[in-house]
């Protein structure tokens, strides 16, 4: 070993070196939280970059760059360090127009904490392992969601566009002429029935057990879907999103009420099955796999 490499190894294995890097990262994080940093922080920024560069150089000199088995770039944690340094120099010395987007990458410096604290490193390692183990469960989840999304697509396609339409028109107005002119919120409120405080027109359906319109209104299929057009089963992707919403129980009772009002109460069965299978079974299966992965990592 050359003297330079021996010194580098000594520095690298010293506890004070780890402490210095740790303090640098924490101080750097504090500086990053500043709203309007004063001009002198620019020099502090250069100091941080210098310390990170020094750390990487020490590691490269001690372990080698990338040829051997235990070299600098063979450790995934060092990739993060390398990216941080590259972006630090890029944003500082290369004129790349919209630098603010690149400055975002400075936040990666906070992630360097993980590689310095041994406990955190273990937990993140377990997290990565659990994600690997989750692949099969994820495939199963996506498959189940896809199947139910396709069923939802067949059962409820277009249903959430059913609205209660006013039964009195001007002489020159027909349903189609109104459909072609509906634009503003004001237009919608003029022709459709809205419950007090509601941002969407009252939903209805054509089957006997679906929601009926009040007197003076008729159920028609016009306009956009509820919630600014985001809630629907009109395409596979929207249906998939709706099913994901059911699985995660994200305000699912609203989707349930909307769909049952538009399609009919019979379809409650669909929601019962989805909630039991997707929300109770699959979510807990995911949690079980994550718990197992942590257990294995701890052992």
């Amino acid at each position: 070993f050359s003297p330079l490499r021996r010194i580098s190894i000594k520095i690298l294995v010293h506890s004070l070196f780890s402490m210095l890097i740790m303090c640098t990262i924490l101080t750097n994080c504090i500086f990053m939280t500043m709203n309007n940093p004063p001009d002198w922080t620019k020099n502090v920024e250069y100091t941080f970059t210098g310390i990170y560069t020094f750390e990487s150089l020490v590691k490269i000199l001690a372990r080698g760059f990338c040829v051997g088995e235990f070299t600098f770039l063979r450790d995934p944690w060092n990739w993060l360090d390398f990216v941080v340094i590259v972006f630090a120099y890029l944003t500082e010395f290369v004129n790349l127009g919209n630098v603010s987007a690149l400055r975002t990458f400075r936040v990666l410096r906070a992630l360097k904490t993980i590689s310095v604290i041994p406990g955190l490193k273990t937990i993140v390692g377990a997290l990565i392992q659990s994600v690997k183990k989750l692949s099969d469960v994820m495939i199963l989840t996506v498959f189940c969601l896809s199947v139910f999304a396709l069923i939802g697509l067949q059962l409820f396609m277009g249903n959430l566009k059913h609205k209660c339409f006013r039964n009195s028109l001007e002489n020159n107005e027909t349903l189609e002429s109104i459909m072609n002119t509906l634009e503003s919120e004001e237009d919608f409120r003029k022709y459709f029935y809205y419950l007090e405080g509601s941002k969407d027109a009252l939903l209805c359906g054509f089957s006997t057990d679906s929601g009926q319109c009040p007197e003076g209104y008729t159920c028609v299929k016009i306009g956009r879907n509820p919630d600014y057009g985001y809630t629907s089963f009109d395409t596979f992707s929207w249906a998939f999103l709706a099913l994901f919403r059911l699985m995660t129980q994200d305000y699912w009772e609203n989707l349930y009420q909307q769909t049952l009002r538009a399609a009919g109460k019979t379809y409650m069965i669909f929601f019962v099955v989805v909630i039991f299978l997707g929300s109770f079974y699959l979510i807990n299966l995911i949690l079980a796999v994550v718990a197992m992965a942590y257990e294995e990592q701890n052992q």
């Epitope: 396609m157 339409f165 349903l175 299929k221």
Partner: nanobody, 124 residues
């Protein structure tokens, strides 16, 4: 293809009567907002004659008020236009319009569905 069946047109003398029928008997017709009669006289634009909403309330063009009566038979899914005291200016092609929702089998569709038209000629 959605079809409305119109009947009852013909030639009649001024002051005479006619009864037009519009049957939306196909199972495709689910629910209307209104079903109405429109007419197009030679060289003129199509205009509303009368319409009846699903709850029974009606609209008439000013020129036919008191002479024409629109009614419906929900069981037969048919709308009638009783035309009395006919005048030469009533001569036109009368169209039936179902403005509402149909079923394509796969989905519901709302819009305007027109008949082929039935000719009414008032002349002496």
């Amino acid at each position: 293809e959605v079809q409305l069946v119109e009947s009852g047109g013909g030639v009649v003398q001024p002051g005479g009567s006619l009864r037009l029928s519009c049957a939306a008997s196909s199972r495709q017709f689910i629910r209307d907002v209104f079903t109405g009669w429109y007419r197009r006289a030679p060289g003129k634009q199509r205009e509303l004659v009368a319409r009846i909403y699903n709850e029974g309330n009606t609209n008439y063009a000013d020129s036919v008020k008191g002479r024409f009566t629109i009614s419906r038979d929900n069981a037969k899914k048919t709308v009638y236009l009783q035309m009395n005291s006919l005048r030469p200016e009533d001569t036109a092609l009368y169209y039936c319009l179902f403005s509402g929702t149909i079923s394509t089998g796969r989905e519901y569709r709302s819009g305007d569905y027109w008949g082929q038209g039935t000719l009414v000629t008032v002349s002496s």
